[in-house]
């Protein structure tokens, strides 16, 4: 399942790059799989929010991206995730790349990596 989620993530990132016109030389933060969940590409200044992953949920590669990007266009969007909710983790896209997750996964989600033994 871990490998499958990673593969699905890379697929999603590729599709998002095409939609957003991202390439290797684009400024901003590349999409990434951080060994826990999937982060879509973002522009500098954007905050991306994700829900805590369900550990053994199998991704549907055709579903909409499960993160929300907070930019000016997203303000007031009642469908977007909210950092004031529990079980939500954010990263900022800065000129130096992705920030650390906030809160840390262990505090927001109750775990901080997929276990090597299950």
């Amino acid at each position: 399942i871990f490998k499958k989620e990673q593969a699905m993530c890379l697929e999603k990132i590729q599709r998002a790059n095409e939609l957003m016109g991202f390439n290797d030389s684009s400024p901003g933060c590349p999409g990434m799989w951080d060994n826990i969940t999937c982060w879509k590409p973002a522009h500098v200044g954007e905050m991306v929010l994700v829900s805590c992953p369900e550990l053994f949920r199998i991704f549907n590669p055709d579903q909409v991206w499960e993160t929300e990007t907070i930019g000016e266009s997203d303000f007031g969007d009642s469908n977007s995730l909210d950092l004031s909710d529990m079980g939500v983790v954010s990263r900022n896209c800065t000129e130096d790349g992705w920030s650390e997750p906030f809160p840390h996964y262990f505090d927001a989600c109750g775990f901080d990596e997929y276990e090597s033994e299950t």
Epitope: L83, D85, M86, D107, E113, E115, S116
Partner: antibody
């Protein structure tokens, strides 16, 4: 019924190492659901979380920055207990020290506590 | 570190009273907040976690509310065994800081 039983000396000299042990019954230090924490309480600093150890396929620790350079929390799987070591103590480390189990349900909380050990740092 | 403050620092009340204790965080903590009760010479006891979920075995006269930076613990119909000190604790960022406590004593 989870119970935590603390043991260790109540008097430690300045610059020495404070060592306390917390024996677990009704649960295991190797539980994949729990964390095992140390907290202290003094009139000057109130309740202060110090750190935790936990097992998720491998052992991990998180420590409070205020004591990070001086603290070690170690599990002992053979006895299902965990220990606190605080090095280079000063009188400011005088406090009641508690061990506690952390559990997760939407957030981490401390649901079972040891009885507390008053540790005085004095020469 | 996130600073947790509580008000009042102490209050006097009578059996049967309804009391409210406030806890404020120095930055938003969503609902990552716990409440504990402590009696003299004893360890703290968990009452409420995640802002408003009652711990198993805790009487329903205790309730928690709030989100973000402002939280309240309410005790409806105060009982003799409720005279104690109450602490809030944020559970979102290491170190997991506690409030200074609110002492509830008999009027």
């Amino acid at each position: 019924q989870v119970q935590l039983q603390q043991s260790g000396p109540g008097l430690v000299k300045p610059s020495q190492t404070l060592s306390l042990t917390c024996a677990i019954s009704g649960d295991s230090v190797s539980s994949r659901q729990a964390t095992w924490n140390w907290i202290r309480q003094s009139p000057s600093r109130g309740l202060e979380w110090l750190g935790r150890t936990y097992y998720r396929g491998k052992w991990k620790n998180h420590y409070a920055v205020s004591v990070k350079s001086r603290i070690t929390i170690n599990p002992d799987t053979s006895k299902s207990q965990f220990s606190l070591q605080l090095n280079s103590v000063t009188p400011e480390d005088t406090a009641v020290y508690y061990c506690a189990r952390g559990m997760w349900q939407g957030n981490w909380f401390l649901d079972h506590w040891g009885q507390g050990t008053l540790v005085t740092v004095s020469s | 570190d996130i600073q947790m403050t509580q008000s009042p620092s102490s209050l006097s009340a009578s059996v049967g009273d309804r009391i409210t204790i406030t806890c404020r965080a120095s930055q938003s903590i969503s609902r990552y907040l716990n409440w504990y009760q402590q009696k003299p010479g004893k360890a703290p006891k968990l009452l409420i976690y995640a802002g408003r979920i009652l711990q198993s075995g805790i009487p329903s006269r205790f309730s928690g509310s709030g989100s973000g930076t402002d939280f309240t613990l309410t005790i409806n119909s105060l009982q003799p065994e409720d005279f104690a000190t109450y602490f809030c604790q944020q559970a979102i960022i290491n170190p997991y800081t506690f409030g200074p406590g609110t002492k509830v004593d008999i009027k």
